[in-house]
């Protein structure tokens, strides 16, 4: 999103892209700015729609939290170093469900003013692993991915058979983890051809990932990604 | 109550392999940072180790490819596994929430490198 | 590497006095990341301040924290016989995850 001051100083231009967290990890929340030569006229605010404090104040080259919002005490940063190029994200420590939501962040410079709000998403996403399955009777593939959330969709692939519909052939089950917010997917292929590419392709409204695995008389080969969705800049 | 209990020091040879658990009640470990932070004797804290609630871990430099930390979510337990243990290993090793900051710790439990 | 020096090593005072605690960062450190413990012979540590100046649950309100960017400080206001212990400050997020400094040791004079 890309927002405009207004008031009697000129408008400057911030940019922020909307991201997603991974929940138990460090999330990052980015906003950039038109950039100032000196530092200390530099001011970030980083607010979120729904809490009443500050999410993160930084002025005069230093944080200031002194009207920061009891949910965000020890928990953000903004990268101070790189402040004085336009850098306005925010660092949000162990992010967790709740911290999804809009999020403004307003930039005043000697140049002027700016705001630009951010969508942020929180979920867990996770790599699949696939391996064969040796509990399985026939030739079998399972794949395992410790930590989504919202629940995902899971499809399988093949190579070789590119418009086939495994559903039939598949069966998917979700683990709720012990502190019953993510799961854990577990997708088991059944009746696998040697010499052909599998891929197993889990995906939510935050991330898609796909884990590749080929089975041949000598060897086992895997390969896996993670792609986050809907980053794009407002 | 939110509490935190280490075991599995214990006096051990150069060279040789220990594990510590650190059990936690009151909270659910997988949500939390947890930490390992040890203490030679007379001497100041040292962060060890952190896994994260989603399972990523860091190490510091001076234990880097010697340990590793993990979690049983089912036992609500936290471990370090320690291998190639020296002499500089001998301290005190706490394990410690991180939330906000760390603001729960065990007792500690004492892991002696000697011959 | 972020390096955090306390000072002095050791501060000798009497109970009532005002004790004030130094940590001085190699590089900045946010304000959010910047913890304070105290540690008394025999036990674990125990967290007093977050977020540079945020008192812990049940820390008395004779200890308060201040400071941001390399200077930081942990101030007791009046100190009470049961004050006197090492104490330490503590950054996060950077490489390493964690660093602690060397400890203030609070003696009685």
């Known amino acids: 999103i890309i927002g405009f001051g207004i008031s009697g100083r000129h408008s400057i231009t911030v940019t922020t892209l909307t991201s997603a967290g991974n929940i138990g990890e460090d999330g990052i929340l980015s906003c950039t700015f038109e950039p100032d030569i000196k530092l200390s006229d530099i001011v970030i605010q980083w607010l979120k729609e729904g809490v009443t404090g500050l999410v993160h104040e930084f002025k005069k080259g230093k944080d200031d939290l002194s009207d920061q919002d009891e949910m965000f005490r020890g928990r953000t940063a903004v990268f101070a170093d790189q402040v004085i190029v336009g850098n306005a994200s925010l660092r949000l420590k162990n992010v967790q469900l709740t911290d999804a939501g809009t999020y403004k962040c307003y930039i005043i410079t000697s140049k002027g003013k700016g705001n630009a709000k951010l969508e942020y998403k929180t979920g867990a996403f996770s790599i699949p692993e696939v391996n064969v399955d040796s509990n399985a009777s026939s030739e079998s593939l399972r794949c395992e991915a410790p930590r989504w959330f919202p629940q995902p969709t899971v499809v399988w692939a093949s190579q070789v058979d590119q418009g086939a519909n495994f559903s039939e052939v598949s069966n998917t089950s979700f683990e709720l983890n012990p502190e019953n917010v993510t799961m854990k997917v577990v997708s088991v292929l059944y009746n696998v051809t040697i010499n052909t590419t599998y891929s197993c392709m889990i995906e939510n409204d935050i991330a898609k990932a796909t884990g590749d695995i080929r089975v041949t008389d000598s060897e086992i080969k895997r390969q896996s990604h993670l792609q986050l969705l809907n980053s794009k800049a407002s | 109550e939110v509490q935190l209990v280490e075991s599995g020091g214990g006096l051990i040879q150069p060279g040789g392999s220990l594990r510590l658990s650190c059990a936690a009640s009151g909270f659910t470990v997988s949500s939390n940072y947890m930490n390992w932070v040890r203490q030679a004797p007379g001497k100041g804290l040292e962060w060890v180790s952190v896994i994260y609630g989603s399972g990523r871990t860091y190490y510091a430099d001076s234990v880097k490819g010697r340990v590793t930390i993990s979690r049983d979510n089912s036992k609500n337990t936290l471990y370090l596994q320690m291998n190639s243990l020296r002499a500089e290993d001998t301290a005190v090793y706490y394990c410690?929430?991180?939330?906000?900051?760390?603001?729960?710790w065990g007792q500690g439990t004492t892991v002696t490198v000697s011959s | 590497e972020i390096v955090l020096t306390q000072s002095p090593g050791t501060l000798s005072l009497s109970p009532g006095e005002r004790a004030t605690l130094s940590c001085r960062a190699s590089q900045s450190v946010s304000s959010s990341y910047l913890a304070w413990y105290q540690q008394k012979p025999g036990q674990a540590p125990r967290l007093l301040i977050y977020g540079a100046s945020s008192r812990a649950t049940g820390i008395p309100d004779r200890f308060s924290g201040s400071g941001s960017g390399t200077d930081f400080t942990l101030t007791i206001s009046r100190l009470e016989p049961e004050d006197f212990a090492v104490y330490y400050c503590q950054q996060y997020g950077s490489s390493p995850m964690y660093t602690f400094g060397q400890g203030t040791k609070l003696e009685i004079k």
């Open positions: 410690a929430r991180d939330t906000y900051a760390m603001d729960v």
